[in-house]
């Protein structure tokens, strides 16, 4: 058993049929010695008396808010949560496996630049009685500070019969140099509590590996005289690291109709303009990627050909 | 501790081309190592990230773009003194700081060159003959060093009398290649910045 936060404790249980469970001793936080009784949750049934209460925690029915009272007055609370371990593996029931970039990916993180700011998100089908707490650091043995905000519900989607909820959190490394060469990864730890179930999820990454620039901005078309070719120009996204001559991007320019199966024109360039062939009912799209370290491409920025 | 904005004339920066070749060569070599050593811990997640130049050179700090010198977090540098001549310095107005930056890059290359050559000598003794260093990568390191053209004491190639542990050597190769790729990215960014200045 360990303390998650003040008056909240996590009991780690091997989860299998007829498991013996864990013996837990609760102590009432009071100077009083006599006349103390214990109850669980909203029940008025007295579970025991005395300053300590010993319980055998085997299942979710044994978890919950234990309260010690004296003469009708509440003295203190202890909330017990369960963390299940099945076949030596901690349960991952609360969050959905996003399977990208690999299986057992519960947390996904992205950074728009090298400033040390990043966003992580996760998915769940659970809609109520759900809380998340996020901690992060650079390295684990001698951790350096990363400050994370509160996790918030950022999107709701309908997937078949199910509703899916996306939560996200923003974090900022306390003292980040955009030009630094990372040798210790960022560690992100998410504590998830659903009713009386506790789970924790972790992700470890270098900022350089989770870079995904914003799409290029200010796309403009200039038809070339006596030609079917069009000069398309754009600018670096505002959120990208500066100076741009140091943090350079490379671009992919594509002309395509509405369907992905349609024919297309495609060209790659390090410049902020390119010449392509425009077709009726097609769109010109441009996306960006770090020129020197190939992490993710940005989303497309698009303008219609006409 | 920073690069001035008005340095070489545009297009007069001969090291840019070499630094692009360097990044390409080390990336190819790393990809080859990952594929060939698929049953060894050779991915970014699996290896320890070591920097053989740590406390010996200060490339990131010495080559910091002027715009980043206002960032307190970028200025915790170790001072290192270097020789200040070199053919990539395309203008007489080149500042001492730029010379410091380029000589720091030169020292990095020299250290990695020695490590890679020593390692290749060991890998050539491996009866499995599983992996060797790409001669192209070693040649590209050499070309960039020549373009930088700093006078510097030659570092003797480390020789070892004991039997090499080939497993450890291959793990170390992965560690070195990952670190060298990150440094090659920095070098490419620096050269691009100087070329644009």
């Amino acid at each position: 058993i360990w303390e998650l936060k003040k008056d909240v404790y996590v009991v780690e249980l091997d989860w299998y049929p007829d498991a013996p469970g864990e013996m837990v001793v609760l102590t009432c936080d009071t100077p009083e010695e006599d006349g103390i009784t214990w109850t669980l949750d909203q029940s008025s049934e007295v579970l025991g008396s005395g300053k300590t209460l010993t319980i055998q925690v085997k299942e979710f029915g044994d978890a919950g808010q234990y309260t010690c009272h004296k003469g009708g007055e509440v003295l203190s609370h202890s909330l017990l949560l369960l963390h299940k371990k099945e076949d030596g593996i901690w349960s991952t029931d609360i969050l959905k496996d996003q399977k990208e970039p690999k299986n057992k990916t519960f947390l996904r993180c992205e950074a728009k630049n090298y400033s040390g700011r990043f966003t992580c998100w996760w998915l769940t089908t659970i809609s109520t009685d759900l809380t998340f707490s996020v901690k992060s650091s650079r390295g684990s043995s001698d951790p350096q500070g990363v400050t994370c905000g509160a996790a918030t519900l950022s999107a709701e989607r309908v997937r078949g019969d199910n509703k899916e909820y996306e939560y996200s959190v923003e974090c900022q490394e306390d003292s980040a140099c955009p030009a630094a060469e990372e040798s210790l990864p960022i560690e992100v730890m998410v504590d998830a509590v659903h009713k009386l179930k506790y789970e924790n999820y972790t992700s470890s990454f270098f900022i350089r590996d989770i870079i995904k620039p914003d799409p290029p901005k200010n796309l403009q078309l200039k038809p070339l005289k006596n030609s079917r070719q069009v000069e398309v120009s754009w600018e670096y996204p505002d959120t990208w690291s500066t100076p741009h001559s140091y943090f350079s991007l490379t671009f992919c320019v594509q002309v395509q109709g509405k369907s992905k199966r349609e024919k297309k024109d495609r060209v790659f360039t390090d410049k902020t303009s390119a010449t392509v062939i425009c077709r009726k009912n097609a769109s010109i799209s441009v996306r960006a990627q770090d020129r020197y370290y190939s992490s993710s491409w940005s989303e497309w920025a698009s303008v219609p050909c006409s | 501790r920073n690069l001035p904005v008005a340095t070489p004339d545009p297009g007069m920066f001969p090291c840019l081309h070499h630094s692009q070749n360097l990044l390409r060569a080390v990336s190819n070599m790393l990809q080859k190592a990952r594929q060939t050593l698929e049953f060894y811990p050779c991915t970014s997640e699996e290896i320890d990230h070591e920097d053989i130049t740590k406390d010996k050179t200060s490339t990131v700090e010495a080559c910091l773009p002027l715009e980043l010198t206002k960032n307190e977090s970028c200025l915790n540098s170790r001072e290192t003194s270097f020789i200040t001549n070199g053919s990539c310095l395309a203008s007489r107005k080149t500042s001492f700081m730029m010379a410091l930056c380029l000589s720091s890059i030169y020292e990095d290359l020299k250290m990695y060159q020695v490590e890679f050559k020593t390692m290749n000598a060991k890998l050539l003794m491996d009866p499995k003959r599983q992996i060797f260093l790409d001669q192209n990568m070693l040649a590209v390191i050499d070309e960039l060093m020549q373009a930088l053209n700093f006078n510097s004491e030659t570092v003797p190639q480390k020789s070892s009398l004991e039997e090499p542990d080939f497993y450890k050597t291959k793990i170390k190769l992965c560690i070195l290649l990952h670190a060298f790729r990150i440094r090659a990215v920095t070098i490419d960014r620096v050269m691009s910045y100087l070329n644009a200045s």
Partner: antibody, heavy 118, light 107 residues
Framework: QVQLVQSGAEVKKPGASVKVSCKAS????????LHWVRQAPGQGLEWMGW????????EYAPKFQGRVTMTTDTSTSTAYMELRSLRSDDTAVYYC???????????WGQGTMVTVSS | EIVMTQSPATLSVSPGERATLSCRAS??????LHWYQQKPGQAPRLLIY???QSISGIPARFSGSGSGTEFTLTISSLQSEDFAVYYC?????????FGGGTKVEIK
């Protein structure tokens, strides 16, 4: 699968014209760009131009501008390349090729040998 | 127009050995570079597109790399069916242009 079948070999006199055909099967002609590339005996490859069968748009290499015409007949799924004012150095194998991407060549025809000789 | 230069013109390699073919562009073309294989009496066949993207059905021993002005096609272990002429082609701008080719022959 996508296939391109070209017309047979031709022998032409200098100053004459030649029209090579390229019949597409296994796909709808308008779904792909169509290029023509030639190869003189023992020489390398030379791009001549492309046509978008969907709208008839064309782009020719400057070297062939004014001397070449590329057309398509969607009803028969056939593309044509006509080269006029033939010279002896136009002796080559002429290939048609198709791709959903405009700038490289995925599916090639078997080639048509055109000999220009007096 | 962009001039593509391939080297060497002829490469003599023993079966099982590694072959490295080079292609250089007269100006920077990013990764707009494609590789083809041509055997005598046959039409060319696309091997690699956009410098390093492999084509399904093409053996994994063929790989491409490079960007800017310098590109490489590597055949990791030459098989008898790989002896042919290899062409690079740029698609950075029109007119599309090919290199002069590299003939890979048996040593």
């Amino acid at each position: 699968q996508v296939q391109l079948v070209q017309s047979g070999a031709e022998v032409k006199k200098p100053g004459a014209s030649v029209k090579v055909s390229c019949k597409a099967s296994g796909y709808t002609l308008t779904d792909y760009y169509l290029h023509w590339v030639r190869q003189a005996p023992g020489q390398g490859l030379e791009w001549m131009g492309w046509i978008d069968p969907e709208n008839g748009d064309t782009e020719y290499a400057p070297k062939f501008q004014g001397r070449v015409t590329m057309t398509t007949d969607t009803s028969t799924s056939t593309a044509y390349m006509e080269l006029r004012s033939l010279r002896s150095d136009d002796t080559a194998v002429y290939y048609c090729n198709a791709n959903k991407e405009l700038r490289y060549f995925d599916v090639w025809g078997q080639g048509t040998m055109v000999t220009v000789s007096s | 127009e962009i001039v593509m230069t391939q080297s060497p013109a002829t490469l003599s390699v023993s079966p099982g050995e590694r072959a490295t073919l080079s292609c250089r562009a007269s100006q920077s073309i990013s990764i707009n570079l494609h590789w083809y294989q041509q055997k005598p009496g046959q039409a060319p066949r696309l091997l690699i597109y956009f410098a390093r993207q492999s084509i399904s059905g093409i053996p994994a021993r063929f790989s491409g790399s490079g960007s800017g002005t310098e590109f490489t096609l590597t055949i990791s272990s030459l098989q008898s069916e790989d002896f042919a002429v290899y062409y690079c082609q740029q698609s950075n701008s029109f007119p599309l242009t090919f290199g002069g080719g590299t003939k890979v022959e048996i040593k």
